[in-house]
């Protein structure tokens, strides 16, 4: 049913869903802090623009007795229950921040007439792509897929002269929410990644993964997995690895690789890590002091969600436009706004764009070094280290299929 919005006459409210099931196990108190810090910034920005209005957030908590698993995979109904609660209380704001679970977001989108914008820190799955009033502030699976396909095809860098067309994907079902949907997208037979690859097999058992590492009859030298170095070590340990194996470790929301004193363990030498370019000012900010490097991005997405709302509110108010209209609901896309840690760009479908960073372990220094970066907004690669000190032969990434010989003429334009 149509819920009246607390969103006019100089008073603008943000409804923040505080759900038991969340993409990251972040204490709700930290998310509240992030939202409150965002509100302070928004108020300041509106005041500086000469807009004398009130902006507040209402935190909507779900029933902990019903939804207390903390696991996104049981979150399907939680969002709808919260919306019902909002409806009963007639407490809908101008914008909804949350949920972060893909199942929950998908279900809410399916079962409600969303005449207001929804901002999510998460909702990584392909099923949340191309939703007209949904904005996602953490890199969704589609962005990862586009990078991987682009990188697979690349054969004109001095360190990557073979196009790849094969891959193993390790997915055992115990992944974190982000990894679950990233790998799910790679596994899906109808996805862009699957469409562009000639061979792809999902490894579901630890033993399958371990056997591939030295299997002379393997069908690909490339294995994609998702998680941190410790996750890889638990799986791989100190097992021998064939010299032309390349493990791509997707670990987007982890800043630890960029910390000064970090040394790459020996088991990472055959690994390329895909992560996001770290923020500069987050390390000392008041809201992030209690956060681990992996949690910063989640809390930051909540904070940036508030700043995004403030940005759009400012534009609409300055233009004398109504906030409770479909136009406002559909406006949270194809724009750049000033986020907490610099400009944040949203694509045509409201998904955040970012700079992905591919790291390798230098055999000389045992440090993580940047190999290349990739701008998801323009789908463009920026090489960084043209002569990397790789573990692989001739300082080049190997062919994806052993013994296939040169692939020089697999040109892609």
């Amino acid at each position: 049913s149509q819920v009246s919005q607390n969103c006019h006459n100089g008073s603008y409210e943000i409804s923040v869903l505080m759900m038991g099931n969340s993409a990251f196990a972040e204490p709700l108190k930290n998310l509240e802090d992030a939202v409150n810090e965002g509100l302070e910034i928004v108020r300041g920005r509106l005041q500086n623009a000469g807009l004398n209005v009130t902006v507040n957030a209402t935190f909507m908590y779900s029933d902990g007795l019903i939804h207390n698993s903390g696991d996104c995979r049981s979150s399907t109904c939680e969002g709808l229950d919260l919306l019902r609660k909002i409806s009963n209380a007639q407490r809908m704001g101008c914008v909804l921040i949350g949920p972060s679970c893909t199942y929950s977001t998908f279900q809410m989108y399916l079962d409600t007439e969303l005449s207001y914008p929804m901002i999510s820190a998460g909702s990584f799955g392909l099923s949340c792509d191309y939703k007209e009033t949904l904005t996602r502030l953490m890199s969704p699976a589609r962005k990862l897929m586009y990078f991987l396909v682009n990188f697979w095809k690349t054969n004109d860098l001095p360190f990557k002269t073979y196009s790849w067309s094969t891959s193993y994907v390790y997915k055992n079902g115990t992944e974190t929410e982000d990894c679950f949907w990233y790998l799910n997208a790679l596994e899906a037979s109808v996805s862009y990644f699957s469409h562009e690859l000639g061979f792809k097999v999902v490894l579901r058992q630890d033993k399958e993964f371990q056997d591939i590492l030295m299997d002379h009859n393997r069908k690909s030298n490339v294995i994609i997995m998702c998680g941190g170095p410790e996750f890889l070590y638990k799986l791989k340990g100190d097992r021998a690895v064939a010299e032309d194996i390349v493990i791509i470790l997707v670990d987007l929301f982890n800043d630890q690789y960029f910390e000064d004193n970090v040394t790459a363990p020996d088991y990472m030498k055959n690994v390329l890590v895909l992560t996001l370019s770290p923020g500069n000012s987050l390390l000392n900010s008041s809201f992030s002091r209690n956060l681990s490097p992996t949690k910063r991005d989640f809390a930051l997405a909540y904070l940036n969600g508030i700043l995004l709302f403030g940005h759009m509110l400012k534009i609409f108010l300055e233009n004398g436009e109504n906030i409770t209209t479909p136009k406002f609901a559909h406006a949270f896309r194809n724009l750049t706004f000033e986020g907490y840690d610099g400009p944040v760009t949203l694509d045509d479908w409201g998904d955040v764009d970012s700079t992905m960073v591919l790291l390798y372990t230098s055999v000389d220094t045992k440090k993580y070094k940047v190999l290349l970066t990739y701008d998801t907004h323009v789908n463009k690669t920026y090489p960084v280290d043209m002569s990397p000190t790789f573990t692989w032969k001739n300082s080049k990434l190997p062919n994806d299929i052993t013994g296939r010989g040169p692939q020089h003429h697999h040109h892609h334009h």
Epitope: L157, P158, K369, Y382, P383, V384, M386, P406, H408
Partner: antibody, heavy 118, light 106 residues
Framework: EVQLVQSGAEVKKPGASVKVSCKAS????????MNWVKQAPGQRLEWMGV????????NYNQKFKDKATITRDTSASTAYMELSSLRSEDTAVYYC???????????WGQGTTVTVSS | DIQLTQSPSFLSASPGDRVTITCSAS?????MYWYQQKPGSSPKSWIY???NDASGVPSRFSGSGSGTEYTLTISSLQPEDFATYYC?????????FGGGTKVEIK
């Protein structure tokens, strides 16, 4: 409009050092690698090294690693190459050239002539 | 290092002629890059990734080839095309250039 403007010609004595600058404009300096290329009279072009201004990563051609030192000042959008222990065979025109992968060396500076003579 | 050998080193031709310059690599490369340089000027990017014209390059220029043999072709030579052309590879590190082909007016 992308422009790479290099410092003026230099005449140096053997054993001295020289620092050539390359000021970039018309694009985001930290987004693109910067190369240095040598063109000695009557010789082919020789690639000397490349720097990524954002991360400070530098790769040298082994032939020039004891001769050239590449640095940058990101606040001034300027790349530098210092040549040490100059000898007569270092007499050449030195160019900076930007990468815009996949089009390597897509824009070049106007060149800086370094003459080494006693 | 990969050696690039250009032939011919000098080429005399008349406006309207079809001109072909070849670049031979000492080992196989995926792509070739070409640059044009006029006297007293810096080189200009001319063709990248074997067959892609850089911006502003006339359509009479084309590149082709694979493996160790690559060519730059000018379908109908114009007065402004008289210059030196260099090939370059970045398949192996370090990148290397050919010795150049000087296209002169006959």
């Amino acid at each position: 409009e992308v422009q790479l403007v290099q410092s003026g010609a230099e005449v140096k004595k053997p054993g001295a050092s020289v620092k050539v600058s390359c000021k970039a404009s018309g694009y985001t300096f930290t987004d693109h690698n910067m190369n240095w290329v040598k063109q000695a009279p009557g010789q082919r072009l020789e690639w000397m090294g490349v720097m990524n201004p954002k991360f400070g990563t530098i790769n040298y051609n082994q032939k020039f690693k004891d001769k050239a030192t590449i640095t940058r000042d990101t606040s001034a959008s300027t790349a530098y190459m210092e040549l040490s222990s100059l000898r007569s065979e270092d007499t050449a025109v030195y160019y900076c050239a930007r990468d815009d992968y996949p089009n390597y060396f897509d824009y070049w500076g106007q060149g800086t002539t370094v003459t080494v003579s006693s | 290092d990969i050696q690039l050998t250009q032939s011919p080193s000098f080429l005399s031709a008349s406006p309207g002629d079809r001109v072909t310059i070849t670049c031979s690599a000492s080992s196989s490369v995926n792509y070739m890059y070409w640059y044009q340089q006029k006297p007293g000027s810096s080189p200009k990017s001319w063709i990248y990734r074997t067959s892609n014209d850089a911006s502003g390059v006339p359509s009479r220029f084309s590149g082709s080839g694979s493996g160790t043999e690559y060519t730059l072709t000018i379908s109908s030579l114009q007065p402004e095309d008289f210059a030196t052309y260099y090939c370059q590879q970045y398949h192996d590190y370090p990148p290397t250039f050919g010795g150049g082909t000087k296209v002169e007016i006959k």
